[in-house]
């Protein structure tokens, strides 16, 4: 869709004749009629095949016609059509004088007739005009001309509809050739698809307009990049959505077990070493004179019996003194003045003598220790119980009590709440921070797996003949009930006609 | 061919919340191409437009009714739906859904059959 | 709120030419389509895009469009086309119907 544009500029008839030759009276009223059509090789009468249109009366013999309205016409005239523009064409520009003011062809006598000029060629679409000048020997017209596309219309030849647009269904507006140039922000055929945050994730983001980037389900952060762990996950990470991978140290289901408890709570005071014995669970290796599960209690300085062969500790501000027995010298009261000839050794130790008889040593029975064999072996004073376990003197040996949680010969291991098997008809058990979990197998539910789920073993079908099929809910299995004349678990089998007897 | 097929009850108490479903059949709801929309129809008068929305979730709805309208997508069941609220008689209408091609400038190019709504106490 | 404009009604002869037109401000400026409804069912699209036609829809239906006025032609009206006509613009991110036109094939 266009307009062929026809600018009239200037008409010269300086004898103001008609194309007759007879002159007109008192001068030549002059209009024009215009005829667009297709290209013909040489010009021709016959249908406007693009479009007339006349002016009113625009000056008298010669004159100059102003742009725009001119006495209600138009200049330059239009001539409007609906096709695609072919390139070519032909014109016909008529003028005519009007002795009356009825200017329809029917009202003008054949002679009124001034000029005649026709002409043919090609023309593109542009908004250059064209400057023509055509002469007669009695008249002369000047005129230019262009064809332009309508609003909305593009392309070589106005033939491409481009309406600009800012609605969801396209954001553009229209290049000259009629194809459509995205606003900016927006891509896509019709421009209709946001163009996101720069880096925002092709799969895992998405928007609704243009510098925004939203995250689909599973996903998180500026550019949806950040997988969103499980609910719940608390020292864990993903790197695909509701994952919960342990951080080191941690473990279980949330990764909520602590694993490390040396580290992460640092429970040994007083410069203790601390052990991980299991899942929440450490023990601390005190520092001399430290005592106490986390090694929280200061020890005496005679509590460690430092003073030997029978000598008596006296605590000081500055340590510890050993009051010794006769006999005996030394810090530690180590040193005898004694021999194996004064029977130092007690409780059926025998007695060496060393250094040619200067010194001796004595050799304990079992249960017995110290220099003379004068103490009892206390098999606790190594504090060998882990996890806060309390250690029990049982004769020639010893038993740690375990606190709850705790088992093992020095409660060293962690009670596990599965140990007991308590998930039911052969159920999983998970341990959990603060209990477990069963996984019940199919058929079985509730929070130990003591729950029989009817499970319909009548399901696949599995009886013959059109047989009745009933679940036993107590064995989940099927029972088919036999139409007459089969038998068998399923019904398989045809039972044997009866023979026909010949009487 | 793509299908589309409205459900929901055919009768609402005024005051309440005349809620639809459209299920798409034969084509993908998860297409930039098209938006889905709802068009009503009051009886014996001419055809309004709802609103519409798109696979991901964006929506555009009738300044006349945009107060009472929720439109919403499902692309897992490949179905939009259509929720109005505080509804009074004049809501009463045959209540079409249609989906709307990006490539015909937003023209309604395959439409549901169509169900009616009455609202009454 | 932008308004489209149909006459309510169009008398045509079978084999004659039906026009319906459609007013709107500076309509020409926005893409135009037309639906056809017969009693009882759903509408059907026969022009999009000005004067676009849908697979199926037979040619004697075309479409123009310009300055304020939008134009649904039916050429050689048959009597299958006895139905109302509906005109659909979009505005403001707003989808907005005309009033309907009935046509009757005399």
């Known amino acids: 869709s266009g307009v062929f544009q026809l600018q009239l500029q200037e008409f010269i008839n300086e004898r103001g004749v008609l194309a007759s030759g007879r002159p007109c009276e008192p001068g030549c009223r002059t209009f024009f009629r215009v005829c667009l059509k297709h290209f013909q090789a040489v010009v021709s009468p016959g249908p406007c095949t693009f479009g007339t249109v006349s002016t009113p009366v625009l000056g008298t013999n010669s004159f100059a016609v102003r742009d725009d309205s001119s006495g209600g016409g138009r200049n330059p005239l239009q001539l409007p059509f609906n096709f695609t523009w072919p390139g070519t064409f032909s014109l016909i520009i008529e003028a005519w004088h009007a002795p009356g003011d009825d200017l329809r062809p029917e009202a003008l006598p054949p002679d009124a007739l001034i000029s005649k000029i026709a002409i043919q060629g090609s023309l593109a679409v542009g908004q250059n005009w064209l400057l023509d000048e055509q002469t007669s020997t009695l008249t002369r017209l000047r005129y230019s001309y262009r064809v332009i596309c309508s609003d909305n219309y593009y392309g070589d030849n106005c033939s491409r509809l481009c309406k600009k647009r800012n609605d969801h269904f396209g954001h553009y507006v229209c290049q000259p050739d009629g194809n459509l140039s995205c606003l900016p922000g927006w891509t896509g055929e019709y421009c209709q698809q946001p163009i996101c945050l720069s880096g925002c994730h092709e799969q895992n983001g998405y928007c609704s307009k243009p510098a925004e980037c939203l995250c689909r389900p599973g996903w998180q952060g500026r550019l949806c990049n950040e997988c969103i762990p499980h609910n719940g996950c608390r020292h864990g990470t993903c790197s695909t959505p509701w994952q919960c991978t342990c951080d080191e140290g941690w473990g279980g289901l949330f990764c909520d077990q602590d694993l490390n408890y040396c580290t992460h709570h640092s429970p040994c005071k007083n410069g203790a070493t601390c052990s991980n014995s299991g899942q929440r669970s450490y023990t601390c290796t005190c520092r001399p004179g430290y005592t106490g599960v986390d090694c929280e209690l200061e020890l005496s300085e005679c509590d460690s019996n430092p003073c030997r062969n029978g000598g008596s500790c006296k605590d000081q501000e500055d340590g510890y003194h050993c009051l010794c027995p006769p006999g005996y010298y030394g810090l530690h009261c180590e040193h005898s003045t004694l021999s194996c000839a004064d029977s130092p050794c007690f409780n059926g130790g025998s007695c060496r003598e060393r250094n040619q008889g200067a010194n001796y040593a004595c050799e304990c029975p079992p249960n017995f220790t110290g220099s003379n064999c004068e103490k009892k072996v206390d098999r606790c004073t190594s504090n060998p119980c882990a996890n806060g376990g309390q250690c029990l003197n049982r004769g020639p040996s010893r038993m740690c009590r375990c606190r709850p949680g705790f088992t093992g010969t020095y409660c060293e291991l962690h009670v596990s709440d599965c140990a007991r098997n308590p998930c039911a008809h052969g159920g999983t058990c998970h341990d959990l921070e603060n209990g477990l979990m069963c996984t019940c197998p199919a058929g079985f539910s509730g929070r130990r797996c003591e729950v029989r789920t009817s499970i319909d073993a009548c399901a696949s079908s599995p009886c013959f003949n059109r047989a009745t099929c009933y679940t036993d809910l107590s064995t989940d299995t099927f029972v088919c009930n036999c139409p007459y004349g089969f038998v068998g678990s399923r019904c398989e089998f045809p039972v044997g006609l009866p023979p026909s007897f010949p009487w | 061919e793509v299908q589309l097929q409205e459900s929901g009850p055919g009768l609402v108490k005024p005051s309440e919340t005349l809620s639809l479903t459209c299920t798409v059949s034969?084509?993908?709801?998860?297409?930039?191409?098209?938006?889905w929309g709802w068009i009503r129809q009051p009886p014996g008068k001419g055809l309004e437009w709802i609103g519409d929305?798109?696979?991901?979730?964006?929506?555009y709805y009738n300044p006349s009714l945009k107060s009472r309208v929720t439109i919403s997508v499902d692309t897992s069941k490949n179905q939009f739906s259509l929720k109005l609220s505080s509804v009074t008689a004049a809501d009463t209408a045959v209540y079409y859904c249609?989906?709307?091609?990006?490539?015909f400038g937003g023209g309604a190019d395959s439409w549901g059959q169509g169900t009616l709504v009455t609202v009454s106490s | 709120s932008y308004e489209l404009t149909q006459p309510p009604s169009v008398s045509v002869s079978p084999g004659q030419t039906a026009s319906i037109t459609c007013s709107g401000d500076?309509?020409?400026?926005?893409?135009v389509s037309w639906y056809q409804q017969k009693p009882g069912q759903s509408p059907v699209l026969v022009i999009y895009?000005?004067?676009q036609r849908p697979s199926g829809i037979p040619e004697r239906f075309s479409g123009s469009n310009s300055g304020d006025t939008a134009t649904l032609t039916i050429s050689g009206t048959q009597a299958m086309d006895e139905a109302d006509y509906y005109c659909?613009?979009?505005?403001?991110?707003?989808?907005?119907f005309g009033s309907g036109t009935k046509v009757t094939v005399l």
């Open positions: 929305i798109n696979y991901i979730g964006s929506t």
């Open positions: 659909q613009a979009w505005d403001m991110e707003a989808g907005v």
């Open positions: 249609a989906r709307e091609a990006v490539s």
């Open positions: 034969g084509g993908s709801i998860s297409s930039g191409s098209y938006y």
């Open positions: 500076r309509l020409g400026d926005k893409y």
């Open positions: 895009e000005d004067s």
